[in-house]
């Protein structure tokens, strides 16, 4: 079972993930981003449910498409290259979701834009941070 120190580490990782996702959202929502209209045409798979750490499997599976879309954006909107940013997120996600490799993601029927996708995972991080004990 998780200890108080491991739970604290989990909280910090979630806060880091939240900041990374918010940074991406702010970067693509930047009014100077000329590629936003094009980026919004890309569709992302949304989790059927996202309330627990194991549901991060669904985010992990969409990180490659996310990186591809971010490559369209002007790099000056982000402090890091998309590859490095996604790599950082991937490391956190892998640690958070644990090694339960048999857990398969189930997706919602409808796809979403990059903005809806990021907002969903931002909400997820915020809710876990506020309820994890």
């Amino acid at each position: 079972a998780p200890t108080s120190s491991s739970t604290k580490k989990t909280q910090l990782q979630l806060e880091h993930l939240l900041l990374d996702l918010q940074m991406i959202l702010n970067g693509i929502n930047n009014y100077k981003n000329p590629k936003l209209t094009r980026m919004l045409t890309f569709k992302f798979y949304m989790p059927k449910k996202a309330t627990e750490l194991k549901h991060l499997q669904c985010l992990e599976e969409e990180l490659k498409p996310l990186e591809e879309v971010l490559n369209l954006a002007q790099s000056k909107n982000f402090h890091l290259r998309p590859r490095d940013l996604i790599s950082n997120i991937n490391v956190i996600v892998l640690e958070l979701k644990g090694s339960e490799t048999t857990f398969m993601c189930e997706y919602a029927d409808e796809t979403a834009t990059i903005v809806e996708f990021l907002n969903r995972w931002i909400t997820f991080c915020q809710s876990i941070i506020s309820t994890l004990t």
Partner: antibody, heavy 117, light 107 residues
Framework: DVRLVESGGGLVKPGGSLKLSCAAY????????LAWVRQTPEKRLEWVAA???????YSPDTVRGRFTISRDNAKNTLYLQMSSLKSEDTAMYYC???????????WGQGTSVIVSS | DIVMTQSQKFMSTSVGDRVSVTCKAS??????VGWYQQKPGQSPKALIY???FRYSGVPDRFTGSGSGTDFSLTISNVKSEDLAEYFC?????????FGGGTKLEIK
């Protein structure tokens, strides 16, 4: 057949403690998230705590620091340790199974907790 | 926290009628909504998940619909055994929250 059987409820004084148990049957206990949901005397349903298959625990502000959810996968049993009880904790406490991708699919019969002096 | 509102506390209907119980979420919850039936003296029983899918064994006269913020549970050809209280619940995010319930009375 999935069954959840709660026990441990009773009458307790404000500030007191109580430990609820829930014995689970008919499914792979260790693979599921389990949760406690309570129903107040006014029939309002409130989510109290959840514990996932990795034993991470989740709870709302109203009970954080007072209630602790835990599980024993070897005994197929879920627990809720309640302390610093208040009159507003008076309720029927239900043990529920949280399906991985959907709603709370199975509920126990409930155990009653009354906090009164 | 997401607030789930069931504006009608009581609904009266007759055997054979069709009745709809509604539920409104304070923010978008996609289709992460479940419906539960609680008969007098019993614990809640899951009827619907993902807003519109019936659990195994639930009669097909129970139909869930909606997405986003507005949801409904429709009971067609109401039977006397449908006398119960019905609750909606969002599982879009923790903390899970429930509607206040709608009690169905049979005339």
């Amino acid at each position: 057949d999935v069954r959840l059987v709660e026990s441990g409820g009773g009458l307790v004084k404000p500030g007191g403690s109580l430990k609820l148990s829930c014995a689970a049957y008919g499914f792979t206990f260790s693979s599921y998230t389990l949760a406690w949901v309570r129903q107040t005397p006014e029939k309002r349903l409130e989510w109290v705590a959840a514990i996932d298959s990795s034993s991470y625990t989740y709870s709302p502000d109203t009970v954080r620091g007072r209630f602790t959810i835990s599980r024993d996968n070897a005994k197929n049993t879920l627990y809720l340790q309640m302390s610093s009880l208040k009159s507003e904790d008076t309720a029927m406490y239900y043990c529920t199974r949280d399906s991985n991708w959907d709603a709370l699919d199975y509920w126990g019969q409930g155990t009653s907790v009354i906090v009164s002096s | 926290d997401i607030v789930m509102t069931q504006s009608q506390k009581f609904m009266s209907t007759s055997v054979g009628d069709r009745v709809s119980v509604t539920c409104k979420a304070s923010q978008n919850v996609g289709t992460n909504v479940g419906w539960y039936q609680q008969k007098p003296g019993q614990s809640p029983k899951a009827l619907i998940y993902s807003a519109s899918f019936r659990y195994s064994g639930v009669p097909d006269r129970f139909t869930g619909s909606g997405s986003g913020t507005d949801f409904s549970l429709t009971i067609s050809n109401v039977k006397s055994e449908d006398l119960a209280e019905y609750f909606c619940q969002q599982y879009y995010t923790y903390p899970y929250t429930f509607g206040g319930g709608t009690k169905l009375e049979i005339k």
